[in-house]
């Protein structure tokens, strides 16, 4: 029976992934019962990605390593809609590392997953970035202009946002 074997395969995958993420929240995508998309619990989902707000305070490098161990990266923001979704889950009195850095201090910003940096899709606070020694980007809230990006020193511990593709089983 096709449906039975599909269910057995799915349960097997879920069991296999439990060693990395003890719980997955899955939804059926579309009308086809074959397509289940999952995010680890309690990650949130938007379009084809899962997001995790890490409240532990770590340097940028340690934050990225923490994400990568889970099969994710520090968040790469591709659209205004994506940023609008992300900020719903952030606290206004906190700052969160993005997957954006300028390792050489030459204002060659690069996303951790090699997505090309597009100046037209950036959400820097006004006047930012403003310091060649501040080589990592955070998102934070400023009462004058709401949520935006700021450059800061990479070693200063911050909260962070991890992003991964949805898990399809």
């Amino acid at each position: 029976n096709f449906m039975y074997s599909k269910t057995v395969k799915r349960l097997s995958k879920l069991r296999e992934y439990q060693q990395y993420h003890p719980s997955l929240t899955c939804v059926m995508e579309g009308k086809d019962i074959e397509d289940w998309s999952c995010c680890p619990t309690p990650w949130t989902s938007f379009q084809s990605s899962c997001y995790f707000i890490s409240t532990g305070m770590q340097s940028w490098t340690k934050s990225q390593k923490n994400c990568s161990v889970m099969g994710a990266d520090l968040v790469v923001i591709n659209t205004r809609e994506e940023q609008d979704f992300i900020i719903q889950n952030l606290k206004r009195n906190s700052s969160y590392f993005l997957g954006l850095s300028d390792p050489g201090g030459r204002r060659h910003w690069q996303w951790v997953d090699q997505t090309p940096y597009n100046e037209n899709v950036t959400f820097w606070h006004s006047g930012e970035p403003n310091n060649l020694d501040e080589r990592c980007a955070i998102i934070n809230f400023r009462s004058s202009e709401e949520w935006g990006w700021n450059d800061i020193h990479c070693h200063v511990p911050q909260k962070s946002i991890c992003k991964m593709k949805k898990i399809y089983i």
């Epitope: 490098t61 990225q64 990568s68 099969g71 951790v112 997953d113 090699q114 399809y168």
Partner: nanobody, 127 residues
């Protein structure tokens, strides 16, 4: 826990071939996307090649396209880098790296995307 061990490096002449291997002693190798990077003295670690968990998707640095081939054998918990027509500029320490991935078709080219690294194997191309 992921533990990676490279082998197969050595001293070869320009135009020669070499195959590097990277073995993982972990139990769930097939859930890890793999990459090869190299580091020449005084330089940053650079991307060479990457492969998805299934082996179906690969990527290469422009400098090695058409000369190097990455492959994997999930039954043997091993990833390979076949290097043909080696050039003096390929001289470097070669590292393999692993990263958990839930997508059979995703590969990763950024060194910071890989939390697990081997110790490296030296490749020297000289006449």
């Amino acid at each position: 826990q992921v533990q990676l061990q490279e082998s197969g490096g050595g001293l070869v002449q320009p135009g020669d071939s070499l195959t590097l291997s990277c073995a993982d002693s972990g139990r769930t190798f097939s859930n890890y996307a793999m990459g090869w990077f190299h580091q020449a003295p005084g330089k940053e670690r650079e991307f060479v090649a990457a492969i998805s968990t299934s082996g179906g998707s690969t990527a290469y640095a422009d400098s090695v396209k058409g000369r190097f081939t990455i492959s994997r054998d999930n039954a043997k918990n091993t990833v390979y880098l076949q290097m043909n027509n080696l050039k003096p500029e390929d001289t470097a320490v070669y590292y393999c790296a692993a990263r958990l991935s839930f997508s059979g078709s995703s590969y990763y080219q950024g060194p910071l995307q890989y939390p697990y690294w081997g110790q490296g194997t030296q490749v020297t191309v000289s006449s």
